[in-house]
């Protein structure tokens, strides 16, 4: 069965930001991603960002920045203003949809421990000692290699006997690891694809059809759901119309990567009022 | 839970006229919109029409001038008019809510539809 997994991170560089990272596991194509917190939808929850594959994104405050990272999983960026960090204690939920299979979704929060395998430390202390910790560590090895060179050329300058060759020292044996959270959750998804910019004349898709039909994804989603599941999903990626006069939908936001087979999303280009035919018409 | 119930679906004769209706309850998330979309047999799915919150209709062409949608606030309910139907109008209907991007309502939740049959 299809499943969500959620991870909440807190960024080590500003630990007033939080990144919650959704991915979708299992077949299908995802129409819609919503992204809440302090419950789940439709059952307390505060909407933060809705993703959409085709049409971008939309967010709200405390939400920075939503954005696909694959064809089936998405990163909401935050911005904590407050001083007491109510994120820290908070639950995200994600909803990754399919119209009209159905809908999965998932919750999670910022985990207790600062393991680096499941997230960023809640607080700078771990980073600053594991900073401190490599530093101290090359500066000894460092202050080892040199006072230990020292001794060995002393001990030549007193020998009358033939000098030896010193040995090249490899300069990339005394490397210093940065420290960086594991993704192991990820290990099952696909490899970040290129963000798209939205535009949606089909001539500046990179599936766009030489008959003027574009393809949108059918990647990542799920198998059907039973009669008495709700589900969520965009109506544009499952063959819907859409207006796109005055460029609304320019700067509509990121989308996920087009690869595989599609579905037909305009069946024209040739101007504004070209592609009204299939929803959001005047 | 979003639970979305749509009824009045049925089959009726070219030129006759259905009305659906859709049952909403359980809302917490402030959505922008309510529509219908449909699926023929064989075939992919279709937005039909919207209503945003501002109680603007859009249709898709193929139904303008035969199909009108409204909705009342007051019951949770919304409503698509069916006039004029064609065979080309068969198909599950589903009532949805959802999110705009621009003029374009795209669903959140939905229901499990409704069956219109056009046939003589």
């Known amino acids: 069965t299809p499943e969500v997994w959620v991870q909440v991170q807190m960024e080590a560089t500003e630990l007033s930001s939080f990144t919650v990272h959704c991915g979708f596991l299992g077949p299908g194509s995802i129409s819609l991603v919503t992204v809440s917190w302090g419950g789940p939808d439709g059952a307390g929850g505060t909407k933060l960002a809705v993703l959409h594959p085709e049409l971008g994104t939309r967010q709200w405050a405390p939400a920075r920045q939503a954005r696909w990272e694959t064809q089936s999983s998405i990163s909401l960026a935050l911005e904590d203003s407050g001083a007491s960090s109510p994120f820290a204690n908070t639950t995200f939920c994600c909803k990754f949809a399919s119209f009209p299979e159905g809908s999965w979704e998932s919750c999670g929060s910022l985990p207790p421990s600062s393991d680096p395998g499941l997230s960023a430390p809640p607080t700078p202390v771990p980073i600053l000692r594991a900073d401190l910790a490599g530093i101290l560590g090359l500066s000894g090895v460092l202050l080892f290699g040199c006072g230990y060179l020292l001794h060995l050329l002393r001990r030549q300058k007193h020998r009358p006997t033939p000098r030896l060759q010193p040995s090249h020292t490899n300069s990339q044996a005394l490397t210093a690891q940065a420290w960086a959270p594991s993704q192991a959750s990820q290990a099952a998804l696909h490899d970040p694809y290129a963000t798209i910019n939205t535009s949606f004349c089909p001539a500046t898709l990179d599936t766009a059809h030489p008959n003027g039909w574009a393809s949108l994804p059918t990647h990542a989603a799920h198998q059907p759901q039973g009669p008495a599941a709700s589900a969520s999903t965009p109506i544009l990626a499952r063959g819907s119309f859409v207006s796109v006069e005055n460029g609304l939908y320019t700067q509509a936001g990121e989308r996920p990567p087009h690869t595989g087979p599609g579905l037909t999303l305009f069946p024209d280009c040739r101007g504004p009022r070209a592609v009204e035919g299939r929803f959001g018409v005047r | 839970e979003v639970q979305l119930v749509e009824s009045g679906g049925g089959l009726v004769q070219p030129g006759g006229s259905l009305r659906l209706s859709c049952a909403a309850s359980?809302?917490?998330?402030?959505?922008?919109?309510m529509g219908w979309f449909r699926q023929a047999p064989g075939k992919g799915l279709e937005g039909v029409a919207h209503?945003?919150?501002?109680?603007?209709?859009r249709y898709v062409e193929s139904v303008k001038g035969r199909f009108t949608i409204s909705r009342d606030n007051a019951k949770n309910s919304l409503y698509l008019q069916m006039n004029s139907l064609r065979a080309e109008d068969t198909a599950v209907y589903y009532c949805v809510v959802g999110f705009k991007f621009g003029d374009y309502c795209a669903p959140n939740d939905w229901g499990q539809g409704t069956m219109v049959t056009v046939s003589s």
């Open positions: 209503i945003d919150s501002d109680g603007i209709p």
């Open positions: 359980g809302f917490t998330f402030s959505t922008d919109c």
